[in-house]
Interface confidence: medium
Amino acid sequence: CPGACVCYNEPKVTTSCPQQGLQAVPVGIPAASQRIFLHGNRISHVPAASFRACRNLTILWLHSNVLARIDAAAFTGLALLEQLDLSDNAQLRSVDPATFHGLGRLHTLHLDRCGLQELGPGLFRGLAALQYLYLQDNALQALPDDTFRDLGNLTHLFLHGNRISSVPERAFRGLHSLDRLLLHQNRVAHVHPHAFRDLGRLMTLYLFANNLSALPTEALAPLRALQYLRLNDNPWVCDCRARPLWAWLQKFRGSSSEVPCSLPQRLAGRDLKRLAANDLQGC
């Protein structure tokens, strides 16, 4: 067992070295380790094959370090890995698209608060078992086409607290099992009418605190399972162009937040849902 760590076997073979001031991944981690806790240290780099010997590893926590670089082959050989937590590493900024390849059993991936500015093509390729993907509180500006295409089992996608300005047509392709999509506290001004086409199982959608003045009801039409929708804190324009959204909200059987109008001035602060159809005039 490495010097700064504690190793124990029950209930799982564990190497635990949190908050020890470590500046590098320690050498001598027992190969039988099923869980490795390295959070809260000062590790800045995860070299290639850092954990290659740990074939039984299911949980790896590297959160709250000072990671600036993760070699593309850092997690090579971890075919049984189920939880990988890299969050709270604000200097990371980018992740090589090959980093997570081969992690076919991964079901939870934490990349929140990593200063990420973009999601490289193929970053999540092959992560067929992934259920939870935490990408909140980064600096993401765009959602490239087909980024999540292979994530057919993903149920929770957290993208809040970024700088995303639009939701393009193919941003969420392939997310057939998605239950919860959090997009609040971004800069979303435009949602493509077909952006949510694959989200037939979505139950919760947060779009509050964005820059939406309108939302095409065509985008909401595929959301057959939707139960909870938050649209507050957007600059909604409640003129004739809001009529389709107003009509959709009247028919919506689930729960929704208020949808306060910003314009026209005479309706400022009023809830779109509570307006009458003939209030929505002038274009």
Partner: antibody, heavy 122, light 110 residues
């Protein structure tokens, strides 16, 4: 001031189920973690599990994993704890408690409900 | 049997300084922060200390906390009669993947 208002006392038969509710005042419901903690007569505090409404995920103490279900209704700002297959030693005061959302585990609890007394007796 | 170990009782006279200990292991206090709760008779628990040594607003500075290795301590300096209560330590346990409490310490002000 944030308050947690719990449902009233319950008397249940062994083998039955109980569902306790906890309504949070204020509009920041989703941004917190909610735990359920119980205290049996003459015993200490015991964490049963919790839920983070925004993430929609519940986590349970190993002891209760098979018997407890914790859910949240965001539209009602309410969390629920359902305990099945009740036994006499489940007689306790059940507290709902709120804590800040720090990572994905349940951190300290800074606001507590007043508790719901559940008595299991034949 | 509680995961965290506290003395079942402690006592002191008004004005005295009392320390309550909380012993854990590497998977809980050794890896995670300690919190302390006060439970007055007939009342719900109240947070006294979080993050090992931080006091929420409204908690008097007579209460202080610390953590060293796998143990935590709560110190009450200048004991007052209204401090008579049960005190519980708590932490997260990585091994059990859950929150754990101590068995509680009943503080009597003599």
């Amino acid at each position: 001031e944030v308050q947690l208002v719990q449902s009233g006392a319950e008397v249940k038969k062994p083998g039955s189920s109980v569902k306790v509710s906890c309504k949070a005042s204020g509009d920041t419901f989703s941004s917190f973690g909610f735990s359920w903690v119980r205290q049996a007569p003459g015993q200490g505090l015991e964490w049963m599990g919790g839920i983070i409404p925004m993430y929609g995920t519940a986590k349970y103490a190993q002891k209760f994993q098979d018997r407890v279900t914790i859910t949240a209704d965001e539209s009602m700002s309410t969390v629920y704890m359902e305990l099945n297959s009740l036994r006499s030693d489940d007689t306790a005061v059940y507290y709902c408690a709120r804590g800040p959302l720090v990572r994905y585990y349940f951190y300290y609890m800074d606001v507590w409900g007043r508790g719901t007394m559940v008595t299991v007796s034949s | 049997q509680s995961v965290l170990t506290q003395p079942p009782s402690a006592s002191g006279t008004p004005g005295q300084r009392v320390t309550i200990s909380c012993s854990g292991s590497s998977s809980n206090i050794g890896s995670n922060t300690v919190n302390w709760y006060q439970r007055l008779p007939g009342a719900a628990p109240q947070l006294l200390i979080y993050n090992n040594d931080q006091r929420p607003s409204g908690i008097p500075d007579r209460f202080s906390g610390s953590r060293s290795g796998t143990s935590g301590s709560l110190v009450i300096s200048g004991l007052q009669s209204e401090d008579e209560a049960d005190y519980y330590c708590a932490s997260w346990d990585d091994s059990l993947n859950g929150r754990v409490f101590g068995g509680g310490t009943k503080l009597t002000v003599l």
